[in-house]
């Protein structure tokens, strides 16, 4: 019989499972892209928009080389969990303006949470500790003013997008060395 | 500081219109999304209307929904409500309120509408 | 009939604790962030909480607010004389597209 239910079998093929994380991680690139492009459409952004408590860009083209599987999970997963928290906070605190976009950020948090669950499943297949966040999440405060709650938006799906690109590109050079 | 006067109250019959303003000084108008929210004679609140900050986002209560309609002139610093077709049940004082996101953190002292023949 | 149910009236003497409580559904309460507002007799309605739990500068820390699932509760600690008013609760439902609230609570301070 195989292992007892609930304990994570170990995967036959690391490569396959992270094939799975891959695809999943390019799909929410492809949903994140074109959110935010219906975004531009709909509230034009003026200029680059930023928000402290988003998280930094993990990788850089730099950095890409010297880039180890556990870290790199652990990073994503941490970095995604906070984007998760973004989008949950976007949808309640948002006004009618957002409001409209309710769907589209309602299905974008489900496949962040899918996503986050398949990464999860990754480390544990893999062995890795399951790393919990440097710091305990900061509630975040609610925005200054609707267009306060449209600027962030954009810088959500902005950090969200390049976080993802990233990944995709890291995870595939991982794929690589295993 | 903020502040929201509402005016264009008074008594009208039944079937008639009117058109409600509040206006807005103290912050910037044009990055907050405004509401109209009514309150009948010894009753609850009840939310009426809300319109973004840009104007082009507009949600109404079934109640008012087609009869009632809510607009903005960022310019003026000023929200309207334009009631047709009232009502007996539409008797109320009718308040504006400032939202920076989910919640009213300003409203106006309140016009009241008596709506009679 | 309001879409969140409060009780009609809550009482008590200065000094006492007193809760309020607010029921929603998934769609308000359940999915969107609670606020609580105070009316004071003749005049128009105050933010007294936001965000669930939140309270706007200037609002004394006897009042705090709480919420889980589909239910969310106001409390007043140390009760006094000026806190006798109408309380009510809201937040936005996605199935209506719209701001709902509670029916209010009137609070009388007895004594």
């Known amino acids: 019989p195989g292992p007892p239910a609930g304990s994570p079998r170990v995967s036959s093929d690391p490569r396959a499972d992270l094939d799975s994380a891959v695809l999943l991680t390019r799909s929410l690139l492809a949903d994140t892209r074109q959110l935010a492009a219906q975004m531009r459409d709909k509230f034009p952004a003026d200029g680059d928009h930023n928000l402290d408590s988003l998280p930094t860009l993990a990788m850089s083209a730099g950095t890409l080389g010297s880039l180890q599987l556990p870290g790199v999970l652990t990073r994503l997963r941490v970095d995604l969990m906070s984007y998760f928290r973004h989008v949950q906070w976007l949808r309640r605190a948002a006004g009618p303006s957002l409001k409209t976009l309710e769907p589209e950020l309602g299905a974008l948090q489900a496949r962040l949470e899918r996503l986050l669950r398949r990464l999860q499943l990754l480390m544990s297949r893999l062995a890795l500790p399951q790393a919990a966040p440097d710091q305990p999440a900061v509630p975040l405060g609610p925005p200054a003013s609707a267009w306060g709650s449209i600027r962030a938006a954009h810088a959500i799906l902005g950090g969200l997008h390049l976080t993802l690109d990233w990944a995709v590109r890291g995870l595939l050079l991982l794929k690589t060395r295993l | 500081q903020v502040q929201l006067v509402e005016s264009g109250g008074g008594v009208v019959q039944p079937g008639r219109s009117l058109r409600l303003s509040c206006a807005a000084s103290g912050f910037t108008f044009s990055h907050y999304d405004m509401h109209w929210v009514r309150q009948a004679p010894g009753k609850g609140l009840e939310w009426v209307a809300v319109i973004s900050y840009s104007g082009s986002v507009k949600f109404y209560a079934d109640s008012v929904k087609g009869r009632f309609t809510i607009s903005r002139d960022n310019s003026k610093n000023t929200l309207y409500l334009q009631m047709n077709s009232l009502r007996a049940e539409d008797t109320a004082v009718y308040y504006c309120?400032?939202?920076?996101?989910?919640?009213?953190?300003?409203w106006g002292q309140g016009t009241l509408v008596t709506v009679s023949s | 009939q309001s879409v969140l149910t409060q009780p009609p009236s809550a009482s008590g003497t200065p000094g006492q604790r007193v809760t309020i409580s607010c029921s929603g559904s998934?769609?308000?309460?359940?999915?969107?962030?609670v606020n609580w507002y105070q009316q004071l007799p003749g005049t128009a309605p105050k933010l007294l909480i936001y965000y669930d739990d939140l309270r706007p500068s200037g609002v004394p820390d006897r009042f705090s607010g709480s919420k889980s699932g589909t239910s969310a509760s106001l409390a007043i600690s140390g009760l006094r004389s000026e806190d006798e008013a109408d309380y009510y609760c809201s937040a936005w439902d996605d199935s209506l597209s719209g701001v709902v609230f509670g029916g209010g609570t009137k609070l009388t301070v007895l004594g």
């Open positions: 309120a400032r939202t920076p996101g989910s919640h009213f953190d300003y």
């Open positions: 998934s769609s308000n309460i359940g999915s969107n962030y």
